[in-house]
């Protein structure tokens, strides 16, 4: 039977018909009482007082309604949930993940996790309705958890007509003994001791450091990982692990040469709710490597949307060479990460100026051969984009990656819905296409346009009647990603390059073949 439920857009929590709840109003001390009525939340302000007993974790402020028994927690930054029990900054799980309270919500198959409070899970052994739900990390959310001491976090997903448990693709904090760091590396306890310039770190207990805050003498030294060693650490919440060094007999500090543990290609995919011509409206969290590139034009004021881009490392964006034919000065370009709506700032978006960009020397503006460009983001440190649920790198493919013909992949972008539309999409879209065999990616299949070995084709293979809504890239999507699942991670296979019209039956879109440019990419990203 179909159930009417409400989804609170602010908290992503779900509620049954006629259920009520309290919610804090962001950036104010007000509290709203909400009621689920025919699938719509109706909310109004209510008076509150401080709670008579503490009910919020992680420093949350508890307030209870004046005239009934419900309570609400105002959570400090970095925490969420009914009782502030969710750690929104946890980027990985330790050991088996029993204590994991992060926000990863994607199963290994790529399926979206089901909300633990969903009535469909009422008969399951683990749900948000259990009396010990809070202790187990379960509640009104769909985040991966390990309540039964399994080997790693898991969740329920709906597949083959039923709800079954599946392990999550949540990153583990220590993958074997690989010496790398997650997030900003504040939990890094590895043994790297060289800086980015190749200098050796000073021991944290060195006499030279007397008077410095972060040394082995710090009262919290043990908790911060400081001691009688010279290993890189991040005791002060900086961008990444660092250490003290002597440079030309002067005491200073430098970021370390510690690789970050790759979380590339992992994402929290949510099933698109709305079909639109040429694809589906999507959330940026489903495509966190998608960048939007804007350009100032000499002739017109303000910035206008230029092209898509792809985040491949903290400071580098991959895009299409043809986007830069106007030879913009780098300072006329802006890159925005973490944005769902093309021209509406996102709450967690990150905005960057461009240091420089590199267009492939052999780009051919007639055939679009070698249609690839790299943009370096401007930053004061060696880090630019900070990883979050809406900003993350895509994986570059291994050089020998060969996916089977007709593999289903996806592209994303803010481009037009159809070729004749005068406007770009107001919201990010995704499209599902299949990789064409090279025998079907030739000049004769594309009106005698030149097709080179540096290109690949992908398109929607569904049978298209006159009303068919075939998925495809379109104008404005250029420079954006064509990604395919490989080894459990979304891997960049193509860069949106060109096509004949948009969404035409049996006419694939054409993409720059990324495996042909791995050495070029690496070469140009060198420090």
């Amino acid at each position: 039977s179909y159930q009417v439920i409400c989804r609170d857009e602010k908290t992503q929590m779900i509620y049954q018909q006629h259920q009520s709840w309290l919610r804090p109003v962001l950036r104010s001390n007000r509290v709203e009482y909400c009621w689920c009525n025919s699938g719509r939340a109706q909310c109004h302000s209510v008076p509150v007082k401080s709670c008579s007993e503490p009910r919020c974790f992680n420093g949350g402020t508890c307030q209870q309604a004046l005239y009934f028994s419900d309570f609400v927690c105002q959570c400090p930054e970095g925490f969420a949930g009914k009782c502030c029990e969710i750690d929104t900054r946890a980027t990985c799980y330790e050991d088996q993940g029993i204590s994991y309270r992060g926000t990863w919500s994607t199963a290994e198959s790529g399926a979206e996790c089901t909300n633990w409070n969903s009535s469909a899970l009422a008969q399951k052994p683990y749900s948000g309705r259990r009396p010990d739900a809070i202790r187990l990390g379960l509640g009104n959310h769909n985040y991966c958890r390990n309540p039964d001491r399994d080997s790693k976090p898991w969740c329920y997903v709906f597949k083959a007509g039923k709800y079954s448990s599946e392990f999550c693709s949540t990153p583990a904090c220590s993958e074997g003994n690989s010496d790398c760091y997650f997030g900003n590396g504040s939990a890094y306890r590895g043994t790297h001791s060289l800086t980015e310039s190749g200098a050796s770190c000073l021991p944290w207990n060195s006499m030279i450091l007397i008077g410095k805050v972060y040394t082995a003498q710090n009262p919290s030294a043990q908790a911060l990982g400081l001691g009688k060693h010279n290993y890189c650490r991040n005791p002060d919440g900086d961008a990444k692990p660092w250490c003290h060094v002597l440079k030309n007999r002067r005491l200073t500090w430098e970021y370390c040469d510690v690789p970050s543990c790759s979380t590339c290609g992992l994402r929290q995919y949510s099933q698109p709710q709305f079909r639109i011509k040429g694809g589906l409206f999507a959330d940026i969290a489903s495509h966190p490597w998608q960048a939007a590139i804007f350009a100032k034009h000499r002739r017109s004021p303000g910035e206008r949307f230029l092209c898509g881009g792809i985040l491949i490392s903290s400071c580098w964006i991959l895009s299409a060479a043809h986007c830069f034919q106007e030879r913009f000065p780098p300072h006329h370009l802006t890159v925005i990460l973490g944005r769902t709506y093309r021209v509406v700032p996102g709450e967690e978006e990150q905005k960057f100026e461009v240091e420089k960009y590199i267009v492939h020397k052999e780009f051919d503006d007639d055939t679009y051969d070698n249609d690839i460009a790299l943009l370096q983001l401007k930053s004061d440190s060696s880090r630019c984009a900070q990883e979050s649920s809406v900003v993350r790198t895509v994986c570059l493919p291994p050089a020998d990656l060969q996916l089977p013909d007709w593999t289903e992949c996806e592209l994303s972008g803010y481009g037009k819905h159809e070729a004749l539309s005068p406007f770009y999409s107001e919201r990010l879209k995704e499209a599902h296409v299949r990789l064409y065999p090279s025998s079907r990616c030739t000049s004769q299949h594309l009106l005698n346009r030149t097709v080179t070995d540096n290109m690949l084709c992908a398109g929607d293979t569904r049978s298209g009647g006159p009303q068919a809504n075939l998925h495809d890239a379109c104008q404005g999507d250029s420079g954006g990603p064509l990604v395919c699942l490989n080894d459990g991670r979304m891997t960049l296979v193509g860069i949106i390059s060109w096509g004949l019209g948009c969404g035409q039956k049996d006419v694939p879109g054409v993409y720059t073949k990324v495996t042909n440019y791995l050495d070029w990419i690496r070469d140009n990203m060198r420090p």
Epitope: D179, H192, L194, S197, G198, D257, V258, P259, K356, I358, K361, L374, Q376, L396, P397, P398, A399, D400, T515, L518, D519, R522, D523, N524, M525, R526, P527
Partner: antibody, heavy 114, light 112 residues
Framework: QVQLVQSGAEVKKPGASVKVSCKAS??????INWVRQATGQGLEWMGR????????GYAQKFQGRVTLTRDTSISTAYMELSSLRSEDTAVYYC?????????WGQGTLVTVSS | DVVMTQSPLSLPVTPGEPASISCRSS???????????LDWYLQKPGQSPQLLIY???NRASGVPDRFSGSGSGTDFTLKISRVEAEDVGVYYC?????????FGGGTKVEIK
């Protein structure tokens, strides 16, 4: 600290192939380059491999004769040179590249002799 | 290919005196990303080469400050302000901007 340890010396007949290994410890995400040096001669760059993705770049002179591969599970890079000739007798070095070739292996002497 | 030409071929030096080695490239070695990948390596007798200077003028970790690098475009110089006995060996310039990467022919520094 990156450390590179190469396999031992080899003696090969003309026309044969040789495969030299280079095991890395420390930060193993940097390019591994291969450089050779004939006795009493200078240094000659042969090619490079990205240990992560496996992408390669070769000097034209060796294209088709040299193959660079890697096994990420054991942090080891390999250089295979085929159709050996007497002039391939040299010490072969692997070197790890980040901002430059800052770390070098100890070298592997390959002798080609009938 | 970019040809790197070093001079002199051989450089007899007196300890405590300065020394200078020149390196000229057959074309500009500014990379498309804007960097100039011109390095200097020293190979001491019986040893693997070691990095001295990277990207024209940056001293590698642990390299004494008597070594300095300079230059731009196609002309580059390595200077040793006061030569010490341990500085003997063959010095190579190297360009890593254009594939194939290439080394200079080497300059042999020996004590007089």
């Amino acid at each position: 600290q990156v450390q590179l340890v190469q396999s031992g010396a080899e003696v090969k007949k003309p026309g044969a192939s040789v495969k030299v290994s280079c095991k890395a410890s420390g930060n193993t995400s940097y390019w591994i380059n291969w450089v050779r040096q004939a006795t009493g001669q200078g240094l000659e760059w042969m090619g490079r491999i990205d240990p992560g993705g496996g992408s390669t770049g070769y000097a034209q002179k060796f294209q088709g004769r040299v193959t660079l591969t890697r096994d990420t599970s054991i942090s080891t890079a390999y250089m295979e040179l085929s159709s050996l000739r007497s002039e391939d007798t040299a010490v072969y070095y692997c070197a790890s590249y980040y901002y430059a070739m800052a770390y070098w292996g100890q070298g592997t002497l390959v002798t080609v002799s009938s | 290919d970019v040809v790197m030409t070093q001079s002199p071929l051989s450089l007899p030096v007196t300890p405590g005196e300065p020394a200078s080695i020149s390196c000229r490239s057959s074309q500009s070695i500014v990379h498309s990303n804007g960097n100039t990948y011109l390095d200097w390596y020293l190979q001491k007798p019986g040893q693997s080469p070691q990095l001295l200077i990277y990207k024209v003028s940056n001293r590698a970790s642990g390299v004494p400050d008597r070594f300095s690098g300079s230059g731009s475009g196609t002309d580059f110089t390595l200077k040793i302000s006061r030569v010490e006995a341990e500085d003997v060996g063959v010095y190579y310039c190297f360009q890593g901007s254009h594939v194939p990467w290439t080394f200079g022919g080497g300059t042999k520094v020996e004590i007089k």
